[in-house]
C-alpha cells in the first residue's frame, strides 16, 4: 500500500511527508527510517527532529523544506541503487500509540545514457539494443524521476486524505492537526 517514488542513480530523491503544527513553533517530533514503520519508533533512523530542531541526521539525508511549518519531506542526495526500498516517515503525535506512520517506496533506476551525436556509431556498437527502444518510452528530457508514480484516481485519493486527515486538538502529546501528503 506504499506510494511509490522514483529517482535515477545520481539524482536527488524526494520523499514527501507533511503535518500542520497546532500552532506556530509547536512542533511534533518526526523520525525517518529505512525500512517499513515498526510498531514503535523508527528503525534504522536516518534523520530525526524534536520539538525545536533537526537533532540527528546522517550524510546525504536532509530536510529541504521548512520543517518548522510541518514540511518534513526527506531529500536523499546523489542516490545509488542501494537506496531503493521502503522509508518510514513517523510523525510522533503526543499520546498513546497515536503516531501517524507513512511507508514510502523509493525505486532507483539506473541513469539513462544519452548518446552524443558524434559518438553514435561507437555507442550503438557497445549498446546495440539501446537505440532501438528510443522513442517508445518517456521523452529523454523528462526528469520527473522523484515524483510519485500514481494515477489520477490515486491523486484524487491523496487529495481527499489531505482534506480529511485532521486530528482533534487534544490527546497524545498536545495533538497537532495532521495533514499528510
Amino acid at each position: 500500500s506504499e506510494v511509490e517514488y522514483r529517482a535515477e542513480v545520481g539524482q536527488n530523491a524526494y520523499l514527501p511527508c507533511f503535518y500542520t503544527p497546532a500552532a506556530p513553533g509547536n512542533l511534533v517530533p518526526v523520525c525517518w527510517g529505512k525500512g517499513a514503520c515498526p510498531v514503535f519508533e523508527c528503525g534504522n533512523v536516518v534523520l530525526r527532529t524534536d520539538e525545536r530542531d533537526v537533532n540527528y541526521w546522517t550524510s546525504r539525508y536532509w530536510l529541504n523544506g521548512d520543517f518548522r511549518k510541518g514540511d518534513v519531506s526527506l531529500t536523499i542526495e546523489n542516490v545509488t541503487l542501494a537506496d531503493s526500498g521502503i522509508y518510514c516517515c513517523r510523525i510522533q503525535i503526543p499520546g498513546i500509540m497515536n503516531d501517524e506512520k507513512f511507508n514510502l517506496k523509493l525505486v532507483i533506476k539506473p541513469a539513462k545514457v544519452t548518446p552524443a551525436p558524434t559518438r553514435q556509431r561507437d555507442f550503438t556498437a557497445a549498446f546495440p539494443r539501446m537505440l532501438t527502444t528510443r522513442g517508445h518510452g518517456p521523452a529523454e528530457t523528462q526528469t520527473l524521476g522523484s515524483l510519485p508514480d500514481i494515477n489520477l484516481t490515486q491523486i484524487s485519493t491523496l487529495a481527499n486524505e489531505l482534506r480529511d486527515s485532521r486530528l482533534a486538538n487534544d490527546l497524545r502529546d498536545s495533538g497537532a492537526t495532521i495533514r499528510i501528503g
Epitope: S1, K101, S165, L171
Partner: antibody, heavy 113, light 107 residues
Framework: EVQLVESGGGLVQPGGSLRLSCAAS????????INWVRQAPGKGLVWIGW????????KYTPSLKDQATLSTDLAKNTAYLQMNSLRAEDTAVYFC??????WGQGTLVTVSS | DIQMTQSPSSLSASVGDRVTITCKAS??????LGWFQQKPGKAPKTLIY???RLVDGVPSRFSGSGSGQDYTFTISSLQPEDIATYYC?????????FGQGTKLEIK
C-alpha cells in the same frame, strides 16, 4: 474530528461467530494504529489486539490468538474484529480505538443460549 | 507477558482529598505507561501518557510519576466529577496489558 463507530454486536449462541466493525473517520485511516479492547460486565479492560491498516500488520494477546482475527477494508475506512468459537466468558463490550486515545462507544456482545 | 499490578482495587475519599493509585510492572517498561479514567457506560479516556505527561485539556490536578517498574497516579484535590474507575496500561511491548483497575468513590 476523529470518530470511531463500532457495530455488529448482539446475542450469539455459544460456539458461534461474530464480526464487529469499526468505522473510522476524521483522519487518514491507513496511517494510524487501531487497537481492540474488551470489557466483561463489571470487569476490567483487556487488550485484544492491534492492526496497522497501512500494511495489515497485526498483533494479538496470546489467550485470544486462535479466536480473534483483525482485518481492515481500506476502501471503507473500516476495521474488523472476527471472533470465533464464542463462549459465555466472551460476553463483553468491545471497543476499537485509534491508537489508544480516541475510542469508539463500544458494542455489546452477549454469548448465551 | 508483562503483568501490571494496580492498587488499591477500590478506595473511598472525600472531596478535596489527595488520592494516590500505584501500578507496578513485572519488568522495566521504560516509562511507557498510561493512565485512563472510565465512567460507567462510557469508553475509557486517556489522562496521562509516558508516565508523567498530561494529555491536553485534562485538569492539572491529575498527575503521574515513576520510572522502571513503579508508577504512581495522583489526584491532588478530589472533585465530585472524578468519581470513576482508573486503569494503568503498559505499552512498552506486546501484548499490551492493563492494571486491574481502581474504583474511586466519594465518602
Amino acid at each position: 474530528e476523529v470518530q470511531l463507530v463500532e457495530s455488529g454486536g448482539g446475542l450469539v449462541q455459544p460456539g458461534g461467530s461474530l464480526r464487529l466493525s469499526c468505522a473510522a473517520s476524521g483522519y487518514t485511516f491507513t496511517s494510524s494504529d487501531i487497537n481492540w479492547v474488551r470489557q466483561a460486565p463489571g470487569k476490567g479492560l483487556v487488550w485484544i489486539g492491534w492492526i496497522f491498516p497501512g500494511d495489515g500488520s497485526t498483533k494479538y494477546t496470546p489467550s485470544l490468538k486462535d479466536q480473534a482475527t483483525l482485518s481492515t477494508d481500506l476502501a471503507k475506512n473500516t476495521a474488523y474484529l472476527q471472533m470465533n468459537s464464542l463462549r459465555a466468558e466472551d460476553t463483553a463490550v468491545y471497543f476499537c480505538a485509534r491508537g489508544l486515545d480516541y475510542w469508539g462507544q463500544g458494542t455489546l456482545v452477549t454469548v448465551s443460549s | 507477558d508483562i503483568q501490571m499490578t494496580q492498587s488499591p482495587s477500590s478506595l473511598s475519599a472525600s472531596v478535596g482529598d489527595r488520592v494516590t493509585i500505584t501500578c507496578k510492572a513485572s519488568q522495566d517498561i521504560n516509562s511507557y505507561l498510561g493512565w485512563f479514567q472510565q465512567k460507567p457506560g462510557k469508553a475509557p479516556k486517556t489522562l496521562i501518557y509516558r508516565a508523567d505527561r498530561l494529555v491536553d485539556g485534562v485538569p492539572s490536578r491529575f498527575s503521574g510519576s515513576g520510572s522502571g517498574q513503579d508508577y504512581t497516579f495522583t489526584i491532588s484535590s478530589l472533585q465530585p466529577e472524578d468519581i470513576a474507575t482508573y486503569y494503568c496500561l503498559q505499552y512498552d511491548e506486546f501484548p499490551l496489558t492493563f492494571g486491574q483497575g481502581t474504583k474511586l468513590e466519594i465518602k
